[in-house]
């Protein structure tokens, strides 16, 4: 069985301020079980943008219905983009662990650039 890979097909995305950014991510397998999370930045200081398991992320919606048992599309939309949202976004697959889930595979990242609104 092929090991799961996390695919972020877009190296970069350019979005106008005030618009919605779509960040694409797919997994190549349903196994191992575990949640997907999105982060801005890498390393210890990275910012959690979306967690499939829990939390309230009012600006974020998923492109697909993640409650489908065969879902492998973890793309997200982030609304009302501002220049402060610029950065590199990573789609990260975790595998279940006890007591905490363990990072398993990360996508290569998508750089979000924000074009200022014309004045």
């Amino acid at each position: 069985e092929e090991e799961l890979q996390v695919i972020q097909p877009d190296k970069s995305v350019l979005v106008a301020a005030g618009e919605t950014a779509t960040l694409r991510c797919t997994a190549t397998s349903l196994i191992p079980v575990g949640p997907i999370q999105w982060f801005r930045g890498a390393g210890p200081g990275r910012e959690l943008i979306y967690n499939q398991k829990e939390g309230h992320f009012p600006r974020v919606t998923t492109v697909s219905d993640l409650t489908k048992r065969n879902n492998m599309d973890f793309s997200i939309r982030i609304g009302n983009i501002t220049p402060a949202d610029a950065g590199t976004y990573y789609c990260v697959k975790f595998r279940k662990g006890s007591p905490d889930d363990v990072e398993f595979k990360s996508g290569a990242g998508t750089e979000l650039s924000v074009r200022a609104k014309p004045s």
Partner: antibody
């Protein structure tokens, strides 16, 4: 407070049909996958159907596939189970259950009894 | 027949620790939960995602996993804990929700 209230149970003859309903409240129904789980008298729990939040994808074990149909109306916050070609072995209490993000169950209704008997 | 295997019965004295095991699922494709059911009542979720406890469940109930076996531990068992306990799972490889046959917990005395 999450509430799930089943209805529609009763006595039906073998080969007959019945539709169960589950009225949901206290949470955003359209955001959660849902399932039906049954329990025959004196027996254990058996999952019989699941449905995605949007309602487009449904799942069944072999024991009921082709006879039972799960559906939902998100505008009415209601889950359904259409049961056809009923058999004596379908006699059970039927519970609706809310699914967690990973398809386990966190909240259960009180159940409705279905008796298949001639 | 049940896909998940758990003992039919466990007996324990009040104040002691009860452990109920469940096995049968592949670690990489399974999530487990534990459900408590008292006579004439609906099941109540005690543990989900192998070891996570809902906020309304007493701390004496805990879940753990080791390989393909999960364990429900009830510390300081009380008379009110006498009930049937079901192990349930989600199998990502088949999109199904198997259950164990249930374990009757008897609190002695």
């Amino acid at each position: 407070e999450v509430q799930l209230v089943e209805s529609g149970g009763g006595v039906v003859q073998p080969g007959g049909s019945l539709r169960l309903s589950c009225a949901a409240s206290g949470f955003t129904f359209s955001s959660n996958a849902m399932s039906w789980v049954r329990q025959a008298p004196g027996k254990g729990l058996e999952w019989v159907a699941g449905i995605s939040a949007g309602g487009s994808d449904t799942y069944y074990p072999a024991s009921v596939k082709g006879r039972f149909t799960i559906s939902r109306d998100n505008s009415k916050n209601t889950l359904y189970l259409q049961m056809n070609s009923l058999r004596a072995e379908d006699t059970a209490v039927y519970y609706c259950a809310r699914e967690t993000w990973n398809h386990l169950f966190d909240y259960w209704g009180q159940g409705t009894l279905v008796t298949v008997s001639s | 027949s049940y896909e998940l295997t758990q003992p039919p019965s466990v007996s324990v004295s009040p104040g002691q620790t009860a452990r109920i095991t469940c096995s049968g699922g592949s670690y990489s494709s399974y999530y487990y939960a534990w459900y408590q059911q008292k006579p004439g009542q609906a099941p109540v979720t005690l543990i989900y995602s192998d070891d996570k406890r809902p906020s309304n469940i007493p701390e004496r109930f805990s879940g753990s996993s080791s390989g393909t076996t999960v364990t429900l531990t009830i510390s300081g068992v009380q008379a009110e804990d006498e009930a049937d306990y079901y192990c349930g799972g989600y199998d990502q490889s088949s999109y199904t929700n198997p259950f164990g046959g249930g374990t009757k917990l008897t609190v002695l005395g």
